[in-house]
């Protein structure tokens, strides 16, 4: 006769693991007991269960509780065990010694493999800003056994780096991701993708990426100097810019304060029935965290009743 | 046949000693581990010691533990219990058992001798 | 400590009667289970070991059965020898441990 096993029994953490060991042997052999051992290279050789023909299971105290047989229906020629919710200090050799009637004494060794699926972690670098050179944009660490792989999904043009630090059981991957800051990044996806043969399918963490950046300030309304009369109701200066984080804005007028009855709101300045009184030079102060943005333009109210043209100057300041 | 024959008992003071014997015949003695077994008077069985056959390895209840010394002399084909310091609850027939197979988690006592009365009193 | 409960403590029976007697183990022992006989004045005998294979020499109309925690020893009819105290006996760890004992006695 002879012993059926295998060479390596993989399972991921958690699971049972089933140890075979089979007898096949020739008929009116039968097995009187199956002995399984850790015999881990360097150290004695540890008891783990003894299957006998009568007695049933014996499991040594260590291992109390976590050794099984399998389900009926049961071949009394099959000695394999299962080992309950393996760790990762499970992984290494194990020996089964078939003790059988004629034919004597038989043993195998089998290597048990405990798959440590990762945890990954996904953490941000510092606050990208336009105008930076290369910059973290995140750096994303697996851990597990063996070593994972870990890699980005990214429509974001970039540069990756990798390293590894090995631990007595399992390796720990960082991968960095890095870039050059711009608006159009803004929003845009960064995923850490991480697979190891102890995931179904591989693990994905997004991050979204917020590049701060502020754009030049415009202000709209004085397309059309004919428009600007006395007399004329709901004139209104428009101050235009965009910028993460969102701006504020802030009118004022350069040549003294704003005249009475107008209006702000946010970006757009509001005027009363214009009168001369409303000529002048405005300013839009647009400004978020990161920088500040300025633009003026000059109004100059025209009087119908007068021939001469009306002037109007846009400056824009940054 | 296979006869197992303990000795070595009797009236003792607390605090005092005894050494009992248990003379095997009729089977290859060296092959197999021996236990001592205890019965209070008019109570259940207790088990109180083992050894194994190399002589190498031994185990004891708790309640002796660091009193009784197990020993045996193949040569002899004899097995003694040496106990110490000893206390009124362990007066009790002492029985010597041979245990089926030589294993650490015992296996049956499938012969037993006929036992020896230690009192221990004042 | 494996700990080892029969049921009954005693019983009374007559000769003929099917006799059943109980014991629990306090945590799953497999079938490392024996029974033993002991009467009045003598030494344990043993009746069943692995908790339901017959000792040689001993009366088939003893049997025992169980596995795991829970197991039973059957005397299909009694006789008047049969009269005596029963221990179950675990020996899965050490310490091995006895039951309290079942006494049967005559009706």
């Known amino acids: 006769g002879e012993l059926e096993t295998s060479d390596v029994v993989t399972v991921v953490l958690g699971q049972d693991a089933k140890l075979p060991c089979f007898y096949r042997g020739d008929s009116g052999e039968q097995v009187g007991q199956v002995a399984w051992a850790r015999v881990d290279a360097g150290e004695g050789a540890q008891e783990l269960a003894l299957l006998h023909s009568k007695y049933g299971l014996h499991v040594s105290p260590a291992y109390e509780g976590r050794v099984e047989q399998p389900p009926p229906p049961r071949n009394p020629l099959d000695g394999s065990v299962l080992l309950r919710n393996a760790v990762q200090a499970d992984e290494g050799e194990y020996e089964c010694r078939v003790s059988t009637f004629p034919a004597g004494s038989f043993q195998a060794r089998l290597r048990l493999r405990v798959l440590v699926p990762p945890l990954p972690s996904l953490n941000p670098g510092p606050a990208l800003e336009e105008g930076q050179g290369l910059t973290l944009a995140a750096s994303c660490t697996a851990e597990g056994s063996p070593a994972p792989s870990v890699t980005w999904d990214t429509e974001v043009k970039g540069t990756t780096s990798s390293r590894s630090f090995k631990h007595s059981r399992s390796a720990a991957v960082t991968s960095e991701f890095h870039l050059v800051p711009s608006r159009s990044m803004n929003g845009q996806p960064l995923t850490c993708v991480v697979s190891h043969p102890g995931l179904l399918q591989d693990q994905r963490i997004t991050h979204i990426l917020h590049v701060s950046f502020l754009a030049e300030a415009s202000v709209r309304g004085l397309e059309d100097q004919n428009l600007w009369h006395i007399g004329r109701e709901g004139a209104m200066l428009k101050c235009l810019s965009e910028g993460q984080p969102p701006p504020s804005y802030n009118w004022t007028r350069l040549d003294g304060p704003l005249p009475s009855g107008v209006r702000v709101d946010g970006d757009t300045l509001g005027f009363p029935p214009l009168t001369t009184e409303h000529s002048g030079i405005y300013v839009c102060h647009v400004s978020n965290e990161f920088s500040s943005r300025d633009s003026q333009v000059t109004v100059d109210v025209l009087d119908p009743q007068e021939d001469s043209g009306k002037q109007v100057d846009l400056v824009s300041a940054s | 046949e296979v006869q197992l024959v303990e000795s070595g008992g009797g009236l003792v003071q607390p605090g005092g000693s005894l050494r009992l014997s248990c003379a095997a015949s009729?089977?290859?003695?060296?092959?197999?581990?021996m236990s001592w077994v205890r019965q209070a008077p008019g109570k259940g069985l207790e088990w109180v010691s083992r050894?194994?056959?190399?002589?190498?390895?031994?185990s004891y209840a708790d309640s002796v533990k660091g009193r009784f010394t197990i020993s045996r002399d193949n040569s002899k084909n004899t097995l003694y219990l040496q106990m110490n310091s000893l206390r009124a609850e362990d007066t009790a027939v002492y029985y010597c058992?041979?245990?089926?197979?030589?294993?650490?988690?015992?296996?049956?006592?499938?012969?037993w001798g006929q036992g020896t009365l230690v009192t221990v009193s004042s | 400590d494996i700990q080892m409960t029969q049921s009954p403590s005693s019983l009374s029976a007559s000769v003929g009667d099917r006799v059943t007697i109980t014991c629990r183990a306090s945590?799953?022992?497999?079938?490392?289970l024996a029974w033993y006989q002991q009467k009045p004045g003598k030494a344990p005998k043993l009746l069943i070991y692995?908790?339901?294979s017959l000792q040689s020499g001993v009366p088939s109309r003893f049997s025992g059965s169980g596995s795991g925690t829970d197991f039973t020893l059957t005397i299909s009819s009694l006789q008047p020898e049969d009269f005596a105290t029963y221990y179950c006996?675990?020996?899965?760890?050490?310490?091995?441990?006895f039951g309290q004992g079942t006494k049967v006695e005559i009706k």
């Open positions: 058992a041979r245990q089926t197979e030589d294993r650490s988690y015992g296996y049956d006592l499938d012969y």
């Open positions: 009729g089977f290859n003695f060296g092959d197999f581990a």
């Open positions: 050894i194994y056959s190399g002589d190498d390895n031994a």
């Open positions: 945590q799953g022992i497999s079938s490392y």
């Open positions: 692995a908790a339901s």
């Open positions: 006996q675990q020996h899965y760890t050490t310490p091995p441990t």
